[in-house]
Interface confidence: medium
């Protein structure tokens, strides 16, 4: 079968090879698409509701005035010329829609070195097939789950149009001493070949480095941060500095509005408690200093918990990721 790609909403003409140029013609088109159950036969006589979707032209070609997602499938024509010679045409039709230019929303203007940060969310609307979103740092592809890079993806389909909306949220952990002004961009790659990728405008957040002080230690009980549902997790922030600084807590990079305390207790753990926790020590004489981040997770009975609750990895590209 010959592969045909057609843009959604555009007209499509499929030639019926071997058919006489004008009536009378002995030909029939058979369709197996999202609009049909098994095979649908169309003849040059036409007529009926199918004419608005597909009709046979006087020259024997099949005309679809506006291709839709339901028109994906197999189209076959069987024609006999004046001498009784039979010719078959076979097409596989796939449709596509190029989305609008992707955009980065909720982008961070500043990232903190040494801790996970949300860079932004890349959004592409109106594609078919879905396609993919990928992130780039200084023009080089970022690989999820490597070197402090994590990506959360979501694909939604419009209930009426059938077109896809893609979302991709990028989290990175910039290393201390890395690029102070990294350039991030996101690109949409179509699901069908031969169409070039669409790239967002780049964003250039600043990387802020906390003042290095004596290390802030975050101790997790139970060790590893994995706990059965309903259990209790105790996080203790140990700071060697004197006088004792104020200790505040973060979850998934967001400050927890709680009274300052060197101990954070999570009783009766539930799914909403899962996430990445860290503590921030604020000294009167220096800026804030953040601990390593620990991952708190729920283990179902019989599961083995992680051996360590620390989050992180090693360098990446020009933006070293901790």
């Amino acid at each position: 079968a010959q592969n045909i790609t057609a843009r959604i909403g555009e007209p499509l003409v499929l030639k019926c090879k071997g058919a006489p140029k004008k009536p009378p013609q002995r030909l029939e088109w058979k369709l197996n698409t999202g609009r049909t159950e098994a095979w649908k036969v169309l003849s040059p006589q036409g007529g009926g509701p199918w004419d608005s979707v597909a009709r046979v032209l006087p020259n024997g070609s099949l005309f679809l005035p506006a291709v839709g997602i339901q028109d994906e499938g197999i189209f076959r024509c069987q024609a006999m010329n004046r001498n009784g010679k039979e010719t078959k045409s076979n097409y596989r039709v796939r449709v596509y829609q190029i989305p609008g230019k992707p955009e980065i929303v909720d982008s961070a203007s500043e990232l903190t070195a040494g801790v996970p940060n949300k860079v932004g969310t890349c959004v592409s609307e109106g594609s078919y097939p879905a396609g993919t979103l990928s992130w780039h740092l200084d023009g080089k592809p970022l690989v999820p789950n490597e070197k402090g890079v994590s990506v959360k993806e979501q694909t939604r389909r419009h209930p009426e149009t059938g077109l896809f909306t893609l979302q991709s949220e990028l989290m990175v952990t910039p290393a201390r001493g890395g690029d102070p002004r990294p350039t991030f961009s996101c690109s949409f790659s179509p699901g069908l070949p031969r169409h070039r990728a669409l790239r967002t405008a780049p964003i250039q957040p600043r990387v802020w480095e906390p003042v290095p002080l004596e290390e802030v230690q975050l101790v997790v009980e139970p060790e590893g941060g994995a706990v059965a549902p309903g259990g209790t997790v105790t996080l203790t922030c140990e700071v060697p500095a004197q006088p004792s600084p104020q200790i505040h807590w973060m979850k998934d990079g967001v400050p927890l509005p709680l009274p300052p305390s060197p101990v954070l207790i999570l009783p009766e753990i539930g799914p909403q408690d899962q996430g990445t926790y860290s503590c921030v020590a604020t000294h009167s004489s220096h800026g804030p200093q953040e601990s390593r981040a620990v991952s708190i997770s729920i283990i179902e009975p019989g599961e083995e918990g992680p051996t360590a609750g620390s989050v992180g990895g090693s360098g990446l590209g020009t933006l070293a990721l901790a």
Partner: antibody, heavy 120, light 111 residues
Framework: QVQLQQSGAELVRPGTSVKVSCKAS????????IEWVKQRPGQGLEWIGM????????NYNEKFKGKATLTADKSSSTAYMQLSSLTSDDSAVYFC?????????????WGAGTTVTVSS | DIVLTQSPASLAVSLGQRATISCRAS??????????MHWYQQKPGQPPKLLIY???HLESGVPARFSGSGSGTDFSLNIHPVEEEDAATYYC?????????FGGGTKLEIK
């Protein structure tokens, strides 16, 4: 079962102070926050502040800074709220409630309330 | 401070029908995939009682006829079917940032 038992009603003179208590039982007192809420007769609810009984750390609603002082005694599992320089505007029911730490931050157990009446 | 506006201020609903109470925040109370909006029920002479936490999670022991929904700035509490014992004042409360604030309350009367 989990309970917060508040002290009884108070009738006090303007310009004086009052200390309301909230005794916790049935759970680990230092594992949760104690939050305080004000409700004037026939009115809605106003958050006063919260205390971490484990560390003694507090957060106050700006509106109640200087008016309310929150403390906690771990040995007796009791939280206290002192209200100073009382005026008729302070006449209300005061509730203590248990607050989740972490990021939930809702009030899952409430005391029955302490009525404070300021009158000369 | 985040202002929570509840509507209506009062409503009367027939037994077995649906009651819907709205709560609108002056700015978003959602972040990191969570909506920090909670709902309480208060009957005269009693303390408030937690019904729904984090916008849609039913507190244990609360009947399944109570449900919550919404995100960002717009939230609602639904009660269906309404029962006699549901006559009370309902409050929304956010915990997105300090200070926590409550809505003005909605008084539900059963017809």
């Amino acid at each position: 079962q989990v309970q917060l038992q508040q002290s009884g009603a108070e009738l006090v003179r303007p310009g004086t102070s009052v200390k309301v208590s909230c005794k916790a039982s049935g759970y680990a007192f230092t594992n949760y926050l104690i939050e305080w809420v004000k409700q004037r007769p026939g009115q809605g609810l106003e958050w006063i502040g919260m205390i971490n009984p484990g560390s003694g750390g507090t957060n106050y609603n700006e509106k109640f800074k200087g008016k309310a002082t929150l403390t906690a005694d771990k040995s007796s599992s009791t939280a206290y709220m002192q209200l100073s320089s009382l005026t008729s505007d302070d006449s209300a029911v005061y509730f203590c409630a248990r607050g989740r730490g972490g990021h939930y931050r809702y009030f899952d157990v409430w005391g029955a309330g302490t009525t404070v009446t300021v009158s000369s | 401070d985040i202002v929570l506006t509840q509507s209506p201020a009062s409503l009367a609903v027939s037994l077995g029908q649906r009651a819907t109470i709205s709560c609108r925040a002056s700015k978003s109370v959602s972040t990191s995939g969570y909506s920090y909006m909670h709902w309480y029920q208060q009957k005269p002479g009693q303390p408030p009682k937690l019904l729904i936490y984090l916008a849609s999670h039913l507190e244990s022991g609360v009947p399944a006829r109570f449900s919550g929904s919404g995100s960002g700035t717009d939230f609602s509490l639904n009660i269906h079917p309404v029962e006699e014992e549901d006559a009370a004042t309902y409050y929304c409360q956010h915990s997105r940032e300090l200070p926590w604030t409550f809505g003005g309350g909605t008084k539900l009367e059963i017809k």
